[in-house]
């Protein structure tokens, strides 16, 4: 037997993190996002749940909705109508999938100081929103869309086709919610509130995934979800626009699909209102390398929506799939014709382009061996965007302003030098026309949120600086975090290393690789975090490493598209390469190396453990994908094509975890999955377990009854991290 090794942080009065700290969320941080209601006014929910109004220019602030009113209906969220006469209060939040939930809604009349009675809203509602002007309400109930001209008015039913698990109006089905829209809604008001655009998803022909939900009853319930796996029948999608001024006169009008898209299976990808009578729709072929942006206009004479061919813009990838994770959306300029959009330039880096007439004549606005990530706002004279350009670190995010009024346009980094050590990863929230904006810095130091003048970029005030967290961390021994790059052949891999306190290069430490590695993801980010791996470094003396291998984002298409049609190859190879490089650094105990990951990371960690290299002693896979045939069509096919003989079936079969069952014989493997995982179905782990049993390979496993992909209920999460900690400590011979 090897002697057990106990890591003891030496020398000072500071204490190490404990697992309890992590599970209790003791060191969680706060961010502050203003809820903008005008150019210079915003709302924010205070610590004690009052809804407070702020005016930046007059410096006035007052409670517009008291916590007692919130409490009277157990409200957890709110929404002010644009005419400021009403507030909806949201309660009885009931989570469905990643973004979707149902809730009960109450309308509070701010002028009368009472709840609106009569024609109360049905319950539970799937989605509800105010019009952008006035106080019209659109809501989705039982898969149909309803409209109220005023909160106290009777509702007008816009759609009648809605049917549970069959037809969805104004809300996405499972696959569109998770893999395409990333929202709980599929309806959009025109800027003046005259028109309402919405999507109808017909899931009638989609195969059903069914799983048991055990609950407390004598018999389990069966959850049925129309869920298209790779190669299966997909939702049939249609887009409609209804005139909400006279919804009964005309009825919803269907927006035509571009001919080049409609000729085979296709997806709707997003809708952007350009003006009160102009709308932009984005479509995508099922083989997701061709995207079409279509600009449509309302023709008063026929009361019709027209999408002429000369307003169709095609975006195509010849090396992989269109877009990043999603196809980017356009940011239209004031002329309501030209727009700015992020797509790959000739060198394969995603950059901002200006499109005036055709994509072929697009003017490239940004360029370089880095990527533009998001366009926040386009105003008359400025364009605000984020990128990872600064100092060449792909895992940073800074906010830039391009003065588009100037010729040539001039570029300024708004955030690069504000709090250089503390803040290297920003996002922003702009008032309507960017007169003011908030910056939210996520790290690498303590997160901080600040308010700025949109013209001068001057900081006006600190909104949240996490002082309490700073104080509570004073007596904690936090690990040291390094972000560096390693080279192998012609490839460069960025990695983040979390080193135990009092780290000594002359000593040997166990190594845990944390991996995600999915296409267009990024793990090596300059952000603040105190989580499970922070604890493992701080208390247990484990070195943690995260590596962004091929297929990860924001380093150009050559790196990103390397994994196209062959998932499970280079992601794994690059983790192995990194481990070998870490061993060469001299402070890693080669006998004590582990890998763990969740979801796509569970897939990669499983394949790495089964690589036959002998690099890993043990590893954990939580909710892993085990075959791309088991996962959602939109995701799997984006990166793998179709699982058909004449397309890519061979690699679908070669890239399964089950195909490598024999190779798990010489590693300790812990397989974990929630039984009510709607996303990566329990089927994935069931098949791994079956293959391992058939191969007579010993392994450890844990299931979490009735838990979904996040295994996030308090009790389950505690059990999960405690269980994984025991497994790792045993693997690394660390005593309890």
């Amino acid at each position: 037997l090897r002697p057990s090794r106990v890591y003891k942080p030496e020398g000072n009065t500071k204490r190490a993190l404990t697992l309890k700290d992590i599970l209790n969320g003791t060191f969680s941080y706060k961010t502050y996002f203003p809820n903008w209601i005008s150019e210079q006014e915003y709302l924010h929910q205070s610590e004690d749940d009052n809804i407070v109004f702020y005016n930046i220019e007059t410096r006035e602030s007052y409670i517009i909705l008291s916590n007692s009113t919130m409490k009277s209906v157990n409200a957890t969220d709110y929404g002010l109508s644009p005419d400021r006469q009403f507030v909806y209060l949201e309660s009885d939040y009931s989570k469905l999938w990643r973004y979707s939930y149902t809730a009960t809604y109450y309308i509070y009349d701010l002028q009368n100081g009472e709840f609106v009675r009569g024609y109360e809203l049905p319950r539970p509602i799937q989605y509800l929103c105010w019009s952008p002007v006035g106080s019209k309400l659109a809501y989705v109930y039982q898969n149909n869309i309803y409209l109220k001209q005023r909160p106290g008015d009777p509702p007008f039913q816009i759609t009648y086709t809605g049917r549970e698990n069959r037809i969805f109006n104004g809300i996405p089905d499972w696959v569109y919610e998770e893999e395409m829209l990333a929202t709980k809604y599929a309806l959009w008001w025109s800027p003046d509130g005259k028109f309402l655009a919405y999507v109808e998803f017909n899931d009638s022909d989609i195969p059903i995934i069914a799983y048991s939900y055990y609950g407390d009853g004598q018999y389990p319930r069966t959850i049925n979800i129309p869920y298209p796996k790779a190669g299966a029948k997909n939702p049939v999608v249609r887009v409609f626009i209804v005139d909400t001024t006279y919804p009964h006169h005309v009825g919803p009008m269907e927006v035509p699909v571009p001919e080049m898209i409609a000729s085979s299976d296709y997806y709707f990808s997003w809708l952007t209102w350009v003006s009160s009578e102009r709308v932009c729709l984005q479509w995508l072929k099922r083989v997701q390398n061709v995207s079409v942006l279509s600009i449509c206009d309302f023709r008063e004479d026929w009361h019709a929506w027209e999408c002429p061919k000369n307003q169709e813009h095609v975006e195509e990838s010849r090396t992989g799939w269109a877009g990043g994770f999603f196809v980017s959306t356009p940011a239209f300029s004031q002329d309501a014709t030209s727009y700015y959009k992020i797509f790959s330039d000739k060198d394969g880096y995603k950059h901002i382009h200006y499109i005036k007439d055709t994509v072929e004549n697009a003017i490239q606005i940004t360029s370089g061996k880095w990527e533009a990530i998001y366009i926040f706002r386009v105003t008359q004279d400025s364009l605000f965007y984020s990128s990872n350009e600064f100092e060449g670190y792909p895992g940073r995010r800074n906010i830039y302003r391009i003065s588009i009024g100037n010729s040539p346009p001039s570029k300024k980094c708004v955030t690069c030098h504000l709090r250089k050590e503390r803040c290297q990863y920003y996002t922003a929230s702009f008032s309507y026309k960017a007169k003011y904006y908030a910056l939210v810095c996520y790290g690498p130091g303590l997160p901080i949120s600040t308010l700025h003048d949109g013209r001068t970029d001057q900081e006006i005030q600190v909104l949240e600086e996490n002082k309490e967290l700073e104080n509570s961390l004073r007596n904690i021994q936090l690990p040291k975090v390094e972000i560096k790059k390693l080279k192998d052949g012609g490839l460069t891999f960025w990695y983040k290393m979390i080193l135990p306190p009092q780290f000594d290069r002359s000593k040997k430490y166990p190594l845990l690789i944390q991996v995600y590695g999915g296409p267009c993801s990024q793990s090596v980010k300059s952000v603040f975090a105190v989580n499970w791996i922070t604890y493992l470094a701080s208390k247990e003396g484990i070195v943690i490493a995260l590596v962004d291998g091929r297929g990860t984002a924001f380093q150009g298409d050559k790196f990103l598209h390397a994994v196209y049609r062959k998932l499970g190859v280079y992601e794994v190879e690059d983790q192995l390469t990194a481990v070998r490089k870490f061993i060469e650094m001299g402070f890693i105990d080669e006998e004590r190396i582990a890998i763990w990951g969740w979801s796509y990371g569970g897939y990669v960690s499983s394949l790495a453990l089964a690589s036959g290299t002998g690099l890993f002693k043990c590893g954990i896979a939580v909710a892993p994908v085990s075959s791309w045939e088991y996962y959602a069509s939109i995701y799997s096919e984006r990166f793998m094509g179709l699982p058909t003989k004449d397309d890519n079936l061979e690699h679908y079969k070669n890239s399964t975890v089950m195909a490598r069952a024999e190779y798990f014989r010489n590693v300790d493997y812990l397989l974990i999955h929630g039984t009510a995982d709607d996303n990566v179905h329990f089927q994935n782990s069931a098949q791994i377990a079956k293959a391992l049993v058939n191969a007579q390979v010993d392994f450890q496993a844990m299931w979490y009854s009735d838990q979904n992909h996040g295994i996030s209920s308090g009790r389950s999460q505690n059990h999960l991290y405690t269980h994984m900690t025991h497994f790792l400590k045993q693997c690394f011979s660390l005593s309890d």
């Epitope: 009825g251 919803p252 009008m253 269907e254 929506w305 027209e306």
Partner: nanobody
Framework: EVQLVESGGGLVQPGGSLRLSCAAS??????????IGWVRRAPGKEEELVAR????????RYADSVKGRFTISCDTSKNTAYLQMNSLRAEDTAVYYC????????????WGQGTTVTVSS
């Protein structure tokens, strides 16, 4: 080749009814890019779009002058649109044209040859 052929016109007394048909060939009226309309032209009057339908969505629109009296519909299995005209008045006398509009091209309209409706006692 696209063709629209109207039928059903004729002489009718005030208060009477007629049903006009518009048989389309060369394009699909069920396509989301297609709108079918009935346009009338009468001597000394401005051309008027009396009704239009988008068969894919069932979206209909009527001129105020015919609201509640005329009904536009389509039978996609026959690729045919109809205009049911009730409570006809003398001012409804006109040549009625079936028009097909493509939502993929500005003002690109196919026209039929027209059918005459005369309302007179």
């Amino acid at each position: 080749e696209v063709q629209l052929v109207e039928s059903g016109g004729g002489l009718v007394q005030p208060g009477g009814s007629l049903r006009l048909s518009c048989a389309a060939s060369g394009f699909n009226i069920k396509d989301s890019s297609t709108y079918i309309g009935w346009v009338r032209r009468a001597p000394g009057k401005e051309e008027e779009l009396v009704a239009r339908i988008q068969c894919s969505a069932g979206s209909t629109r009527y001129a105020d002058s015919v609201k509640g009296r005329f009904t536009i519909s389509c039978d996609t299995s026959k690729n045919t649109a109809y205009l049911q005209m009730n409570s006809l008045r003398a001012e409804d006398t006109a040549v009625y044209y079936c028009a097909g509009r493509s939502a993929r091209s500005y003002s690109y309209i196919y026209w039929g040859q027209g059918t005459t409706v005369t309302v007179s006692s």
